[in-house]
Interface confidence: low
């Protein structure tokens, strides 16, 4: 079913290479879409013994990975850089790993800011 | 222009049943969670259920389970409540909205009268 | 479940006061609470969203802050079309939940 104007969404935005990338650093940011097509939002972040090193949040783009999915949940057992999605505004604000195979649930929840919306 | 249109109130008698209906336009439906919201008469607005994009997650307030059913059919792009064995305390507005880390889009509210 | 607190649940103000409604959670939800203001007869209109971020329209005299469990709804200068009644929601767990509703009238 076709529809008249982009559908919007919106997530937690982060980039840590944000000063080489000349982008902002951290904030809201309002995704658009093609017409017919789901929105979402990722975060992606690094596990260093246990520290948490954020990578890049954001907006992603139709993904039938992320379909229905409330919470951000990376599943891949011990990747180099984790990535997780999910559907509804501000669902990447807490992100998760939980290994398919099972073992312990580690969700990481960094603090509330009041960032600005990235237009 | 974004907008919910609802259907289906009026006067039932204590242990009927009644069906709701909400119409979105202006957006793609199939891409949000949409809940229903009551108020009662005089009082605050009480969350009564969720939905997810695809039907696939639903919740309810304890003060419905068991009696109200939340459904959806993105291909007829509408959200219906059913509501059995309804109480004199169900009397209320009922709202559809869409989302939920906000409900940014309302529907015009209708009227549910539970009485003999 | 959680429950959301308001306060004051009414008050009486006048054009260009500033108002400020709290809003506690029983138990911390992050920064997942939205404000909204309704008029009697009419659907609720979302204000704010994320504890603190202003919805499209909505003008700037209204802000959100707080996090964790408290958080509170400030009106910088009011406007006659202000005078409505103000509810939180907290969006972190269902079921989801109101705070009781704080009726701002004119004094």
């Known amino acids: 079913s076709g529809r008249g104007e982009a559908e919007t969404r919106e997530c937690i935005y982060y980039n840590a290479n944000w000063e080489l990338e000349r982008t902002n650093q951290s904030g809201l940011e309002r995704c658009e879409g093609e017409q017919d097509k789901r929105l979402h939002c990722y975060a992606s972040w690094r596990n260093s013994s246990g520290t948490i090193e954020l990578v890049k949040k954001g907006c992603w783009l139709d993904d039938f990975n992320c379909y229905d999915r409330q919470e951000c949940v990376a599943t891949e057992e011990n990747p180099q850089v984790y990535f997780c999605c999910c559907e509804g505004n501000f669902c990447n604000e807490r992100f998760t790993h939980l290994p398919e195979a099972g073992g312990p649930e580690v969700t990481y929840e960094p603090p509330p800011t009041a960032p600005t919306l990235l237009t | 222009q974004m907008q919910l249109v609802q259907s289906g109130g009026g006067l039932v008698k204590p242990g009927g049943s009644l069906r709701l209906s909400c119409a979105p336009s202006g957006f793609t439906f199939r891409d949000y969670h949409m809940s229903w919201i009551r108020q009662a008469p005089g009082k605050g607005l009480e969350w009564i259920s969720n939905?997810?994009?695809?039907?696939?997650?639903?919740y309810y307030a304890d003060s419905v389970k068991g009696r109200f059913t939340i459904s959806r059919d993105n291909a007829k792009n509408s959200l219906y409540l059913q509501m059995n064995s309804l109480r004199a305390e169900d009397t209320a507005v009922y709202y559809c909205?869409?989302?939920?880390?906000?409900?940014?889009?309302w529907g015009q509210g209708t009227t549910i009268t539970v009485s003999s | 479940d959680i429950q959301m607190t308001q306060s004051p649940s009414s008050l009486s103000a006048s054009v260009g006061d500033r108002v400020t409604i709290t809003c506690r959670a029983s138990q911390g939800i992050a920064n997942y609470l939205a404000w909204y203001q309704q008029k009697p007869g009419k659907a609720p209109k979302l204000l704010i969203y994320?504890?603190?971020t202003l919805q499209s329209g909505v003008p700037s005299r209204f802000s959100g802050s707080g996090s964790g469990t408290d958080f509170t709804l400030t009106i910088s200068s009011l406007q006659p079309e202000d005078f409505a009644t103000y509810y939180c929601?907290?969006?972190?767990?269902?079921?989801?939940?109101f705070g009781g509703g704080t009726k701002v009238e004119i004094k």
């Open positions: 929601q907290q969006v972190k767990s269902y079921p989801l939940s």
């Open positions: 939905i997810s994009n695809s039907g696939t997650n639903i």
């Open positions: 909205a869409r989302g939920h880390y906000g409900m940014d889009i």
């Open positions: 994320a504890a603190s």
